[in-house]
Interface confidence: medium
Amino acid sequence: VPARETGSAIEAEELVRSSLAWESRANDTREEAGLPAAGEDETSWTERGSEMAAVGPGVGPEEALEASAAVTGTAWLEADGPGLGGVTAEAGSGDAQTLPATLQAPDEALGSSTMPPAIPEATETSGPPSPAVHDKPSVGPELPKEIPLEVRLNLGGSTPEPTFPLQGTLETQPASDIIDIDYFEGLDSEGRGADMGSFPGSPGTSENHPDTEGETPSWSLLDLYDDFTPFDESDFYPTTSFYDDLEEEEEEEEDKDTVGGGDLEDENDLLLPSQKPGVGPGTGQPTNRWHAVPPQHTLGMVPGSSISLRPRPGDPGKDLASGENGTECRVGFVRHNGSCRSVCDLFPSYCHNGGQCYLVENIGAFCRCNTQDYIWHKGMRCESIITDF
């Protein structure tokens, strides 16, 4: 097993001990990833986020959207399936939306779901070890030393199989020791979060990248993909790559985990698959994952600006949208030029790769990640990509 993957597994164990993020993924089938069957006609599967049908009470296991929320705790949260009450959320546009989940407190979710996450298996490779050091600059003390446990709200009623997420936070340590998960991956000024360039001085700016022939190391896709495909002797590409292998088709089942359809006029909007031609609403492909940035999650101050992304201490349930004493903002809001603004409104690209930003009461900014042909975006801010094809 190559050094990088071995190291990653060891580091992953440390992350669990440190209560760093991990994710349980339920029903992880190829179909769930929203990938089309080979041979289908070329189709753009899109859906306007603002027109997306909200899935509310009465959603059955075959039709429910899966949701994930980042919360503090040591167990999965498991919703009861049908009959869930909706969670009201604000979309980035300001529209209220209903999320198909009731978020339990961590202490209410304990019980049979307390088994520790499994270490992802690394595929054996005959190639050389890949670097285990991330090509990101050392991040200052504004990063949290801990990140809450990330869990999946499984509305399908099945037991989640835990896997480690690709997002996490960097422990404060020398740049050479940076571990192979990076919560801020999506902020890479040259990478997938290019739109986040409006974050002045954000991690991911290329100032302190190690220099190889005067260039950023080209294994930049590291950490973005959990397709543990080995790489060979070429040193310019990562062991886990979006490009390495194709999606394996599985036997077609009845379409499930569906959301309503809708045509997309503006293709830069939420890029969700709509129903297939000739298929009515409620029978489209599964399309998304929900990820919330937890109330406790510290994003830090944005240098050189008046925007604070760090939720202030206090009861996260307090209604602080308009600010108390002119200092605090409700979770998911940040102070900008004296008023509390939704991070969804303030940062249109807060959710990467076409994800839709929502605000969930007591939870904060919530990214609904989408899938498309060939790729599946996930992560707390949809910054990661999973695929074999």
Epitope: T229, P230, D245
Partner: antibody
């Protein structure tokens, strides 16, 4: 060193068939998707087909769908492209390439000429 | 399946910088940072020189750089050299069933 070596090209009449092969070495063949990309004389590149590492999934450009079949034999480290019902517009140099979207290694290409 | 749009040819003198554009749509270039550039000498196979918009494989000169703005990706070659004379192809991941789209290619002439 990664090497890809195509063979099987040649002159064929419209409606005819050809089978291209690509012998791969220098990497774990079964771990990677493989693709065929073609280039008509004086034209740009065109992605033709791709196959997953295990061979379980295959994808085709609309222009060849139903006529071309991509396959692989991982025990022989060989990629194939069976081309049937060939048309004049299929005339091109056919390259096999490692991976599917970003092609980090290419073969030298084999010329397929469809002409009567 | 329409190709990405590249100029048919560009030229420059040694030492100069040239930029080759590659224009697509929101379903490809603008939608994802999966733009690659390939260099192809006459009669030879293409060679990857830029991937993910701006990343260089090791061994590729840092005179080659990539960028993207909206629907258009660009390849810039600085300090032009005679050996840069070749065809340059861009490609992008595409959201539709066709997973990769190429440009028509640009012939670079070093005067």
């Amino acid at each position: 060193e990664v090497q890809l070596l195509e063979s099987g090209g040649g002159l064929v009449q419209p409606g005819g068939s050809l089978r291209l092969s690509c012998a791969a070495s220098g990497f774990t063949f079964s771990s990677y998707a493989m693709s065929w990309v073609r280039q008509a004389p004086g034209k740009g590149l065109e992605w033709v087909s791709a196959i997953s590492g295990s061979g379980g999934s295959t994808y085709y450009a609309d222009s060849v769908k139903g006529r071309f079949t991509i396959s692989r034999d991982n025990s022989k480290n060989t990629l194939y492209l069976q081309m049937n019902s060939l048309r004049a517009e299929d005339t091109a140099v056919y390259y096999c390439a490692k991976k599917w979207n970003l092609f980090d290694y290419w073969g030298q290409g084999t010329l397929v000429t469809v002409s009567s | 399946q329409s190709a990405l749009t590249q100029p048919a040819s560009v030229s420059g003198s040694p030492g100069q910088s040239i930029t080759i554009s590659c224009t697509g749509t929101s379903t490809d270039v603008n939608g994802y940072n999966y733009v690659s550039w390939y260099q192809q000498y006459a009669g030879k196979a293409p060679k990857l020189i830029i991937f993910d918009v701006s990343k260089r494989p090791s061994g590729v000169s840092n005179r080659f750089s990539g960028s993207k703005s909206g629907d258009t990706a660009s390849l810039t070659i600085s300090g032009l050299q005679a050996e840069d004379e070749a065809d340059y192809h861009c490609s992008s991941y595409r959201r539709l069933r066709l997973p990769v789209l190429f440009g028509g290619g640009t012939k670079l002439t070093v005067l």
